[in-house]
């Protein structure tokens, strides 16, 4: 049935591991190594094994992976063909490289986090181990011949001569049975003869399709070729014991002459094309740290030279139900903080000779956006913001507040859900942005939640640079400069003129430019100029000036 894509296109249900080999390869029994888990913050380690038919259940000690608790995957059962999506419209080809990049958002791509990976610890460096792959069952190549004698079935009267011949890989067996049926219908067996004929196949015929597994010894750096046959064969020059040809050098051809007493000359001449040494390949994590939260990059690296023909080396990866045939793969649009399993193998002339299984945990993702509950000014110099934290892991908050072109940012503890802003400027619009961040392989900032408020009004500051000048005997010209801080919505200048303690003039203008006429001559006057912002008056600027005697 079709996998149901999640919002990202990748299902998150538990999955059975799918055996990688998709070719009818010569190699039969292959045991996958335990899946080695690697966290990208740790030194990269991997388990790769050459393929041994005996090595069907390799255990990994938890101690070998930083004393991590064992991560068990159970019951890898029968494998279904990956379900494939319906062909969409052809896409425009781009310049091809040898790197496979696949976005998990494609229809029906099934790249499942490994079982149990939804409850992932926040602790970087956590590791886990996984159980081994099951071994592919070996299909027996023999045919069982069953002959039923003494049948007493009630059949129409007739005589039948039946000859049954079965060919096995060991010998030709002729079974001839003559059964005569009487007119009454009862069966009478007159003769029964089973004879083996001495004719044998040639060893060249018998072992025409022999397959081989290459087993690598990391100490000696030599291969053993295991011949997949059902009987103990003999090799010319005694080159094999127990169907194994030992001490084969990488990238060298070896010729083996195979014979057995069940077959005749000519012998089978088997050319062993020995693969490169296993340790010359290393599975490398090529993920860019900036993208490690949603991408996985894996690449086989040749870390030493060898003389084998690189054209004969092929690489395979399987991640979920996606199969790749490149040396390097990139998977995109993955879930952060999830473990994904990829199996890979390298083949030489279609013989598997090494493989690795990786469980890769994607990095912490960018935290989600905090949800602002309210954001307002409660006084002229104060504001308050409250919020709910994002769901995803994060380390701290950054709160920035911007007035006009000025920006101030604060680092806030992850446990805070409210912050009081102090020392704000009155009657000023503040734009606030709040985002969570996490320090992972790199710092990842979550989306910022935004809000704004305008602080309350306050008294404006004093006008300045006030001047009083006489324009005639009984007239004065009063000017001043606007206050530095208006602190309110409106703009109005007031002038009060007092003689003694008596208010003689009270004027209001849009600008601080007053012409005061018809004053009394030779009188002391007090001039008070102040700014009013619609809510509050400012501190007055006070100057004293006297009119002169009339000149007339």
């Amino acid at each position: 049935q079709s996998p149901t894509p999640s919002p990202t296109g990748l299902t998150t249900a538990k999955m059975p591991s799918v055996p990688l080999s998709s070719d009818p390869l010569p190699t039969h029994t292959t045991a996958f190594s335990p899946a080695s888990t690697f966290e990208r913050e740790n030194d990269f380690s991997e388990t790769t094994t050459s393929l041994s038919p005996d090595n069907t259940s390799t255990q990994v000690s938890p101690d070998s992976l930083d004393n991590a608790s064992a991560f068990n995957t159970t019951g890898v059962s029968s494998v279904q063909t990956p379900h494939l999506p319906t062909h969409a419209d052809s896409q425009t080809p781009s310049a091809g490289t040898d790197t496979q990049t696949f976005s998990g958002s494609a229809a029906n791509a099934k790249l499942n986090p490994t079982p149990g990976s939804n409850a992932i610890s926040d602790v970087p460096g956590e590791r886990s181990t996984a159980s081994t792959f099951p071994t592919d069952p070996v299909s027996p190549l023999t045919t069982t011949l069953s002959l039923a004698h003494h049948s007493s079935a009630a059949l129409p009267a007739r005589t039948s001569n039946t000859t049954i011949t079965a060919n096995t890989s060991d010998a030709y067996l002729n079974a001839s049975e003559t059964t005569t049926l009487s007119p009454s219908g009862s069966a009478v067996i007159s003769t029964t003869t089973i004879a083996t004929t001495p004719s044998k196949p040639t060893c060249d015929e018998k072992y025409a399709n022999i397959t081989v597994d290459y087993l690598y010894n990391k100490e000696t750096k030599l291969f053993t070729a295991k011949l997949n046959v059902n009987e103990n064969v003999e090799c010319g020059n005694n080159t094999c014991t127990n169907n194994e040809v030992h001490n084969l050098t990488e990238c060298k051809n070896a010729s083996v002459s195979i014979s057995h007493n069940s077959c005749t000359a000519p012998d089978k001449t088997l050319i062993l094309d020995v693969p490169p040494g296993v340790e010359k390949f290393q599975l490398h994590d090529c993920t860019q740290v900036e993208k490690a939260d949603t991408t996985i990059c894996l690449k086989w690296k040749n870390i030493e030279t060898f003389t084998c023909d690189t054209q004969n080396i092929t690489y395979r990866f399987q991640c979920g139900n996606m199969i790749f045939d490149n040396k390097e793969i990139k998977l995109e649009n993955l879930e952060p903080e999830h473990e994904y399993k990829c199996d890979s193998e390298i083949l030489y002339n279609n013989h598997k000779f090494t493989n690795a299984s990786k469980i890769i945990k994607t990095d912490f993702g960018s935290p989600g956006e905090p949800q602002i509950i309210f954001c307002r000014s409660e006084a002229a110099h104060q504001g308050v913001i409250t919020w709910n934290p994002p769901q995803r892991s994060f380390h701290n908050f950054t709160l920035c507040y911007i007035k006009e072109t000025e920006k101030d940012c604060l680092n806030l503890d992850k446990n805070l859900i409210k912050y009081d802003l102090q020392n704000l400027k009155p009657y000023t619009k503040y734009v606030l942005s709040l985002h969570a961040y996490i320090i992972a392989k790199v710092q990842r900032n979550g989306s910022a939640a935004m809000c704004h408020f305008t602080t309350k009004s306050a008294p404006p500051s004093q006008v300045w640079n006030m001047t009083v000048s006489m324009t005639s005997d009984n007239s004065m010209h009063v000017k001043c400069r606007p206050p530095r801080d208006r602190n309110g919505p409106h703009e109005r200048y007031h002038l009060e003129v007092e003689a003694g303690n008596t208010l003689v003039r009270n004027e209001s203008h849009k600008n601080c430019d007053f012409r005061v006429k018809d004053l009394q001559y030779s009188t002391d006057y007090t001039f008070k100029a102040y700014f009013h912002n619609g809510d509050y008056p400012g501190e007055p600027f006070i100057l004293h000036h006297s009119t002169s005697y009339n000149s007339k």
Partner: nanobody
């Protein structure tokens, strides 16, 4: 202009063999993959086999055809063949040849392929 033309389909008995051929023209990039997909009536398109055009033996098969089908290439003639042995009634489908010039997606997904042939009908009678 890229063209893929399939041939070799037909009606055969269960257990028989059939060989399909796909002639590719207009593909200039040697880095490409050719594949066979099939689609039975009322079913989704299914991956059958793929082969890389350059390099060593790099072939893949769908689980249902492993051991029975063999994909091969003839670079000189620009053709890809699918040898189908021991055919079963469930192999009845329209077989499509496909080519990918961007090797940036899983080889067993039809969305990974850029060019498609018209298809050839294969019918297996029991």
């Amino acid at each position: 202009e890229v063209q893929l033309v399939e041939s070799g389909g037909g009606l055969v008995q269960a257990g028989d063999s059939l060989r399909l051929s796909c002639a590719a023209s207009g593909l200039t990039n040697p880095e490409r993959r050719l594949a066979w997909f099939r689609q039975a009536p009322g079913k989704e398109r299914e991956f059958v086999a793929s082969i890389r055009w350059s390099g060593g033996p790099n072939t893949h098969y769908g689980d249902s055809v492993k051991g029975r089908f063999t994909i091969s290439r003839d670079n000189g003639k620009n053709t890809v063949a699918l040898q189908m042995n021991n055919l079963k009634p469930e192999d009845t489908a329209v077989y499509f040849c496909a080519a990918a010039v961007r090797l940036t997606a899983p080889l067993n997904f039809d969305t990974s392929y850029d060019y498609w042939g018209q298809g050839t009908q294969v019918t297996i009678s029991s």
